[in-house]
Each structure stands twice: as C-alpha cells, then as structure tokens.
C-alpha cells in the first residue's frame, strides 16, 4: 500500500497528549474474509489435537476454542504413538478486550492472551548427562 503522510495534528503514541481511551466500533469489518470449511487437520496431523471451549463473559470475544495436544508423542505411519518425537502446541499471542467491570459492560481494556491454535510434531530436546 501507499504510505500516507500523517496529519501533523495527530499525536504520536509516545506523546503525553496521546489518548488513553478510544472509541471502537465492535462491528467487525471483513469478519468472514478467510471463511473456510473447518479442516480436519486436528485428526490427520501426526500431532493431533482436540479443541476445548474457553468462555469468559467478561472478555470480547467471549468464546475462544483452544487446541490441546492429544498425545505427548507423535503418531507414526502405523497410527501408533512414537515417544521419540513430541507433540507441542502452536501458540499465538492475540489481543482481546477485557470488560473493566461487571457494572460497566461497555468499557474495556486491551489484554494480551496466549492461545494454542494447533499442535505440531518436533524432535525432543535431549539433555546429555555428563
């Protein structure tokens, strides 16, 4: 995209004048831009996972589905668990909105959250004893 020049009247985030509170519309644009049918990777992966429901009504979004690895090891070609490899979660840091209080349902704070979106198979870290 083309870099647009900043309006000189706009304060920088480092500025003491930068607003601590902003008004945000919760009507999301392009919500379905990546709309796709749910894949079955969670079953076909060599490090399969299950999806667990995490609901928190004080958060926006309230419901987040998180991945939990099914095995410690990975699944080999025969469908058996191989403990020479490890299943580990793939974690993504996301920003959510946290309600400031139950009595102020339209006032939020930004909060960082670490969410597991799937699992992958890795070689284990081997510690050699001296």
């Amino acid at each position: 995209g083309i870099a647009m020049p900043r309006n000189p009247g706009c304060p920088n985030a480092e500025d003491k004048n930068f607003p601590q509170n902003v008004k945000v519309s919760l009507n999301i644009l392009n919500k379905s831009v990546n709309s796709r049918r749910p894949s079955d990777y969670y079953n076909r992966s060599t490090s399969p996972w299950t999806l667990h429901r995490n609901e928190d009504r004080e958060r926006y979004p309230s419901v987040i589905w998180e991945a939990k690895c099914r095995h410690l090891g990975c699944v080999n070609a025969e469908g058996n668990e191989d403990h020479h490899m490890n299943s580990v979660p793939i974690q993504q840091e996301i920003l959510v909105l946290r309600r400031e209080s139950q009595h102020c349902p339209h006032s939020f704070r930004l909060e960082k959250m670490l969410v597991a979106v799937g699992c992958t198979c890795v070689t284990p870290i081997i510690h050699h004893m001296a």
Partner: antibody, heavy 121, light 107 residues
Amino acid sequence: EVQLVQSGAEVKKPGSSVKVSCKASGYTFTDYEIHWVRQAPGQGLEWMGVNDPESGGTFYNQKFDGRVTLTADESTSTAYMELSSLRSEDTAVYYCTRYSKWDSFDGMDYWGQGTTVTVSS
Amino acid sequence: DIQMTQSPSSLSASVGDRVTITCRASSGIISYIDWFQQKPGKAPKRLIYATFDLASGVPSRFSGSGSGTDYTLTISSLQPEDFATYYCRQVGSYPETFGQGTKLEIK
C-alpha cells in the same frame, strides 16, 4: 431476519439413530456457535452440547455418553445433531439455538422451532 | 453438575399481581443466570441475561436480580400474555443446566 429452521418430525425404532438439521440464515454463521437443547414431554430443558461451525470444535454433555455427534456445514449454514442408540427416553423435542462467540451475553437469543423425535417400537 | 432448583414449581396468580420466581444453585460457582419464558408448543424465549439485563424487546415489567446461589425473576404487574413456564439457566459451570421450570397459571 435471523432464522433457525429445523428439519421435520421423526419416528425412530429403539437402537437406531436420528439426524436433525438446523439451517441458519440472516446472520454470519461462523460468528455464532450452535447449541442443542432437548425437552422431553412435560419436562424441563436439557443442554446437550455445542458446535463451533468455524473451528469444528464440539463440547458435549457427558450425560449422553458419546451418543451425540454435532457437526456443521459452513457452505450451507446448516448444523446437525445426530443421536445414536436411541431409547424410549430420548423421545423429546430437540431445539437448536445460536450463541454469539463475540459476546456471549447474546447467548441463546434465537431458537429453532423444534424437531419432535419419537422413539417407539 | 450444578443443580438449579426453581421455586415454586407452579404458581397461580391474577392479572396485575406482582410475581417472584426464585432459582437456587446447588453451589455458588456460577457466573450468571439467564431466564427464559416458554409457551406451550413454542421454543423458549430469552427474557433476562447476565442476571439483570433485559433482552431486546422484553417489557420492563420483567426484572432479574441475585448473586451467589440465589437468583430471582420478578414480574411487577402480570399481563395476560405472561402466563407461561419460566426457566432459569446457570452460566459458568459445565454442563450448563436449566432449572426444572415454574408454571405460571391464571388464578
């Protein structure tokens, strides 16, 4: 206009399975989960489970002991509830209801009209 | 599972009466209560969410209150269309459970 339209009444034999559909319209299907609730004749409401059409995630009431399978087809905005190993006590009206993932204070705001399932030999 | 016990299970009242339905949770580990109204042969309709808040299009004669294990639905002045069965639902502990219902009948 938001609508959840369910499939028609079913009569099933004990031991068989039933699959009820719930077609959604009037909103973005993947922004909402679909929950399933049933009501036996003259009884109260019983939560069965939830399906997230976006991720494919499911969570069930353990009371149903693996007999319930919830799925969704994003291409047709339709959710499905399959109940296997039917017994007479599964005779009930089965409802689908949507549940906002963005703000679950908006949970269960719209319901399907209900599907009557009768299990009888 | 958390059991939700509604009382009374049935209630006779007249148009204009003030009516209170209570819902008690078997433990206090719940976040909120939602209330639903159901008429014969129809799907439930959400009345109150998050214990206190009125759902869209619901008349202001309905109100909700409570905390911990005890919750209340109040109808300040009964109207003919309010005769129905009312259910509470606990949110925050799985599986989410409904009360057994309170049938409100015309006296």
